[in-house]
């Protein structure tokens, strides 16, 4: 269980997800751009 406070839907307060994946190479591209900064 998390030690930090929860919202009622179960996500820990302040836990930040990674950035959204980017697909810069058009419709044919299945692979996402790597992130320059990892969380």
């Amino acid at each position: 269980s998390y030690s930090m406070e929860h919202f009622r839907w179960g996500k820990p307060v302040g836990k930040k997800r990674r950035p959204v994946k980017v697909y810069p190479n058009g419709a044919e591209d299945e692979s996402a751009e790597a992130f320059p900064l990892e969380f």
Epitope: V13, G14, V22, L37, F39
Partner: antibody, heavy 113, light 112 residues
Framework: EVQLVESGGGLVQPGGSLRLSCAAS????????MIWVRQAPGKGLESIGI???????YYANSAKGRFTISRDNSKNTLYLQMNSLRAEDTAVYYC???????WGQGTLVTVSS | DIQMTQSPSTLSASVGDRVTITCRAS??????LAWYQQKPGKAPKLLIY???KLASGVPSRFSGSGSGTEFTLTISSLQPDDFATYYC??????????????FGGGTKVEIK
């Protein structure tokens, strides 16, 4: 061909509900981050919410408590359930594959009595 | 939620002009910023991601810069096809208390 096709838009009364669908082809929805975006007539783009590849969902303040994003992996389809609709929810709704040029054609939702 | 503020809202320019659009985030988003171009009745087109990287097929006259909270999109020499509306978009990670995906209000580039 990589493609997103939205459906389910239409005229709904204030307070009503609607479920939009976004059918994907050429890629697997569950492997990618998917965003719902809307655009009111003559206005700018507004992000509604995101479902990450792992199924985690997050919403803009304007959508929290009223809108729910889900997906059906077997149908390779994304959904936007919209409840307690208001006149200001009138817009073209797009589904988008992450940050990319993969946008659906949009579906118009009109909330009016 | 992250708020994105774009300026100007409308810009009048001529073919050949150098055009600069500014986008400000309400909190630091590192370089997780994209720029889109939209024409009437069409879905937006990705121009720039990661603040300064050109998406596939985008002409080199488009460039982006910035990090943290201040970003700019520059068109070095405006072409007839560039008259459109431009949007910045943050795509930073979301949390339960802050949604990280937001668009600026748009900048319409019109013919002077």
């Amino acid at each position: 061909e990589v493609q997103l096709v939205e459906s389910g838009g239409g005229l709904v009364q204030p307070g009503g509900s609607l479920r939009l669908s976004c059918a994907a082809s050429g890629f697997t929805v569950s492997k990618h981050d998917m965003i719902w975006v809307r655009q009111a007539p003559g206005k700018g783009l507004e992000s509604i919410g995101i479902i990450y590849d792992d199924g985690d969902t997050y919403y803009a303040n304007s959508a929290k408590g009223r809108f729910t994003i889900s997906r059906d992996n077997s149908k390779n389809t994304l959904y936007l359930q919209m409840n307690s609709l208001r006149a200001e929810d009138t817009a073209v709704y797009y589904c988008v594959k992450g940050v990319s040029n993969i946008w659906g054609q949009g579906t118009l939702v009109t909330v009016s009595s | 939620d992250i708020q994105m503020t774009q300026s100007p809202s409308t810009l009048s320019a001529s073919v050949g002009d150098r055009v600069t659009i500014t986008c400000r985030a309400s909190q630091s988003i590192s370089v997780y910023l994209a720029w889109y171009q939209q024409k009437p009745g069409k879905a937006p087109k990705l121009l720039i991601y990661q603040a300064s990287k050109l998406a596939s097929g985008v002409p080199s006259r488009f460039s982006g810069s910035g990090s943290g909270t201040e970003f700019t999109l520059t068109i070095s020499s405006l072409q007839p096809d560039d008259f459109a509306t431009y949007y910045c978009q943050s795509y930073d990670g979301s949390s339960s208390s802050s949604y990280g995906v937001g668009f600026g209000g748009g900048t319409k580039v019109e013919i002077k």
